[in-house]
């Protein structure tokens, strides 16, 4: 039994982690600067998307890049519990706090803000430079989706790395996982064409859920053959003229559930991965 | 002046490097196994490409993946001169060999075979599983293109890493370079839509040359609207019914020079990067 409550311990761990973050701001500031620069570069490359076939390619391309970038950037989250492993074991055994207090304290003070920032920065910069769908709900759905991708990827990193002593193996494993997840995200291969004995792998792909949600959010209702004189040409039938046609070709459900089920899946993955990470920390004591 | 000729020294360095390679086969065998597995996985995912809009997406996707995979795999080439840096300085100062002998010896025995193998393996496995263009010249052009991409990416790795003492900085720099090169390769963004003040960056992108060559090689003469006569003049700006239309939309020159200029560009990059790497080794002595 502990002399202090869970909430008191949570506050204490959070405060210390946050102080460490502010006391060593180089990493945080560097991450923000890199994100801003990358956001501006992406914004400049894709500036002012067209409503034609190049507009389809560029929209899909930039949404794919943002999703996979969120995943690969989250690999750095492997350090969260690895770097302080010895300190955690020492303090936990000394009765300073519960595992749960340490776990949630670190998440709240470190993971939550550091994974939220890039999503906010990217969306604010990229959205208006590219001229994505000009509605408030679409803007916030994009921001929320990028956050969910970052959190699920980071949670996966924690689940793999928690309790380990070296970062490198976890990093390698994460990178390999994300490469395969990236293939199954839906840009490099049309998911409707994959053989059934392999296609189930798409359901384990974090970027697939993020990319599908971002596409659903952006493509729905878009016209990619605007003003095409529809009285003339038959070969135009092979064009993808609406966002709905594009989404259907990608095997994406057009209903509202077709959007939100991706966030539900990401939320489930976050819960599962964080549970694994928590259990790995919990069983650390037995082997230390 | 040296008592032995350049050719003798070259043979000696090559033989020693090759013996090291055979004496420690785990790395080489591991690389081959990983390449075979990845080739089979890619072959299974993309098995039997269709001749419709999904066929366009899947062809572009797999060619993009193979190109970028060749680039990112080549990051490991940074180790070639870094790991043996102290040994090289010691032996060079002791008059064992010329810088040129060591340089070309290492290239011939280590870089040449280890970068050639993945290209051969990938092409042999993927080409027939996917059902790419069934002509011998297209098969060997693909193999040659993947080799050229691997060599230029490895040369860039050597140019960055030569003379350095630690691998990590060079690896990070390479990865960042390849991420930007990947954006400019032509899948994630339609290169014809990039603003002129930025579009010149595509000419420094290794995967762009590889991807363009592979697409030119594969798409030319293909029909993606089965049932529509491919010779019909398509005045619809939005439909992509032939490989030529697809290539034109991507801003790719349809002439034979539109294919071979990519290999010329990659060859020039190889020469430039290897020259930089050689000069960096040459000037190492001054600072050691």
């Amino acid at each position: 039994s502990y002399t202090t409550s869970f909430c008191h311990q949570l506050r204490w761990v959070s405060k210390r982690s946050f102080k460490n973050l502010l006391g060593n701001p180089q990493a945080s500031i560097a991450q923000i600067i890199v994100t801003v620069i990358l956001g501006l570069v992406i914004g400049a490359i894709y500036f002012g998307l067209n409503n034609d076939s190049t507009g389809i390619q560029n929209r899909a391309g930039v949404l794919f890049f943002l999703t996979t970038n969120q995943c690969f950037s989250s690999v750095s989250a492997v350090e969260l519990f690895v770097v302080e492993k010895k300190l955690f074991i020492h303090e936990y055994i000394s009765g300073y706090y519960r595992v749960s207090s340490y776990f949630f304290g670190k998440l709240l003070s470190d993971l939550l803000p550091m994974r939220m920032l890039p999503s906010i920065i990217f969306t604010c910069i990229v959205y208006f430079m590219l001229g994505l769908k000009p509605t408030a709900d679409a803007f916030f759905i994009m921001m929320f989706t990028l956050m969910m991708v970052a959190y699920s990827a980071s949670s996966m990193a924690l689940a793999i790395a928690a309790g380990q002593s070296v970062v490198s193996v976890a990093t390698l494993l994460m990178t390999i996982c994300f490469v395969f997840m990236m293939i199954f995200s839906g840009l490099l291969v049309n998911l409707t064409t994959i053989a059934s004995w392999l296609s189930w792998l798409q359901y384990f792909s974090i970027p697939r859920y993020g990319f599908t949600a971002l596409q659903h959010n952006e493509f729905l209702g878009q016209n990619f053959c605007p003003g095409l004189n529809a009285t003339v040409n038959n070969t135009c039938n092979y064009a993808t003229c609406t966002g709905e046609e594009y989404l259907t070709k990608q095997g994406i459900d057009l209903s509202p559930w077709g959007l939100w089920k991706n966030h539900v899946a990401l939320a489930c993955m976050i819960v599962i991965f964080l549970t694994i990470a928590y259990l790995k920390l919990l069983f650390l004591k037995k082997y230390s | 002046s040296y008592t032995t000729s350049f050719c003798h020294q070259l043979r000696w360095v090559s033989k020693r490097s090759f013996k090291n390679l055979l004496g420690n086969p785990q790395a080489s065998i591991a690389q081959i196994i990983v390449t075979v597995i990845l080739g089979l996985v890619i072959g299974a995912i993309y098995f039997g490409l269709n001749n419709d809009s999904t066929g366009i997406q899947n062809r572009a996707g797999v060619l993009f993946f193979l190109t970028t995979n060749q680039c990112f795999s080549s990051v490991s080439a940074v180790e070639l001169f870094v790991v043996e840096k102290k040994l090289f300085i010691h032996e060079y100062i002791s008059g064992y060999y010329r810088v040129s002998s060591y340089f070309f010896g290492k290239l011939l025995s280590d870089l040449l075979p280890m970068r050639m193998l993945p290209s051969i393996i990938f092409t042999c496995i993927v080409y027939f599983m996917l059902g790419l263009k069934p002509t011998a010249d297209a098969f060997f052009i693909m193999m040659f293109t993947l080799m050229m991409v691997a060599y230029s990416a490895s040369s860039m790795a050597l140019a960055i890493a030569a003379g350095q003492s630690v691998v990590s900085v060079a690896t990070l720099l390479m990865t960042i370079c390849f991420v930007f090169m990947m954006i400019f390769s032509g899948l994630l963004v339609n290169l014809t839509t990039i603003a002129s003040w930025l579009s010149w960056l595509q000419y420094f992108s290794i995967p762009r040359y590889g991807f363009t060559a592979l697409q030119h090689n594969e798409f030319l003469g293909q029909n993606f609207c089965p049932g529509l006569n491919a010779t019909v003049n398509n005045t619809c700006n939005y439909a992509t019914c032939t490989g030529e239309e697809y290539l034109t939309k991507q801003g790719i020159d349809l002439s034979p020079w539109g294919l071979w200029k990519n290999h010329v560009a990659l060859a020039c990059m190889i020469v430039i990067f290897l020259t930089i790497a050689y000069l960096k080794l040459l000037f190492l002595k001054k600072y050691s």
Epitope: N51, G221, F224, C225, G227, L228, C236, A239, C241, E245 | -
Partner: antibody, heavy 118, light 106 residues
Framework: EIQLQESGPGLVKPSQSLSLTCSVT?????????WTWLRKFPGNKMEWMGY???????NYNPSLRSRISISRDTSKNQFFLQLNSVTTEDTATYYC???????????WGQGTLVTVSS | DIQMTQSPSLLSASVGDRVSLSCKAG??????LAWYQQKLGKPPKLLIY???SLQTGIPSRFSGSGSGTDFTLTISSLQPEDVATYFC????????FGSGTKLEIK
């Protein structure tokens, strides 16, 4: 010259299904384009309802997606509209038209007035 | 949905007059706007697409202008057969129509 003609009952009871047919002459519906249903309410407001493409792909107005269905009979060169659970609000003149995607409509049917009333 | 607002809802003009009808979009629709003419008991007839392109077979007295959110249909010299209701349609995002302007002769 392509011609489109709507047909169907002029009176439908609330909560029932509205079914309309569009017969196309002068062009085969599987050869191309998107075959669209629109309606004009008594207050002059026009609404795009959805389409079925030459390939059979259907696209509906999100506000109607839960109760609309567009189908076709290629042998008769006809396409159909079914609107379920109608209310008096669905009273309108229903048009079929040809276009590509969301683009302007150069070809229209004459329109058929459907009244929803008990 | 993008709201399309047409003004005025009723317009009276004399034969030979230059007449301008306005259509405002709730948000930017680029130049993806079409104009239709609908006479009583008839289906709508496409006049203008892409804001200013005249549909084949339409008299040259009809012209369209505007981009973004503000658009105008102009009849350079009003004819008796031009009495009708005029609709605008945006096709930038999904497709929506204006509520129409009824044009009559004084």
């Amino acid at each position: 010259e392509i011609q489109l003609q709507e047909s169907g009952p002029g009176l439908v009871k609330p909560s029932q299904s509205l079914s309309l047919t569009c017969s196309v002459t002068g062009y085969t519906i599987t050869s191309g384009y998107d075959w669209t249903w629109l309606r004009k309410f008594p207050g002059n407001k026009m609404e795009w309802m959805g389409y079925i493409s030459y390939s059979g792909f259907t696209n509906y107005n999100p506000s109607l997606r839960s109760r609309i269905s567009i189908s076709r009979d290629t042998s008769k060169n006809q396409f159909f509209l079914q609107l379920n659970s109608v209310t008096t609000e669905d009273t309108a003149t229903y048009y079929c038209a040809r276009t590509r995607g969301y683009n302007p409509f150069p070809y229209w049917g004459q329109g058929t007035l459907v009244t929803v009333s008990s | 949905d993008i709201q399309m607002t047409q003004s005025p809802s009723l317009l009276s003009a004399s034969v030979g007059d230059r007449v301008s009808l306005s259509c405002k979009a709730g948000r930017n629709v680029n130049n993806y706007l079409a104009w239709y003419q609908q006479k009583l008991g008839k289906p709508p007839k496409l006049l203008i697409y892409n804001s200013n392109s005249l549909q084949t077979g339409i008299p040259s007295r009809f012209s369209g202008s505007g981009s973004g959110t503000d658009f105008t249909l102009t009849i350079s010299s009003l004819q008796p057969e031009d009495v009708a209701t005029y609709f605008c349609q945006q096709y930038n995002s999904w497709t929506t129509f204006g509520s129409g302007t009824k044009l009559e002769i004084k």
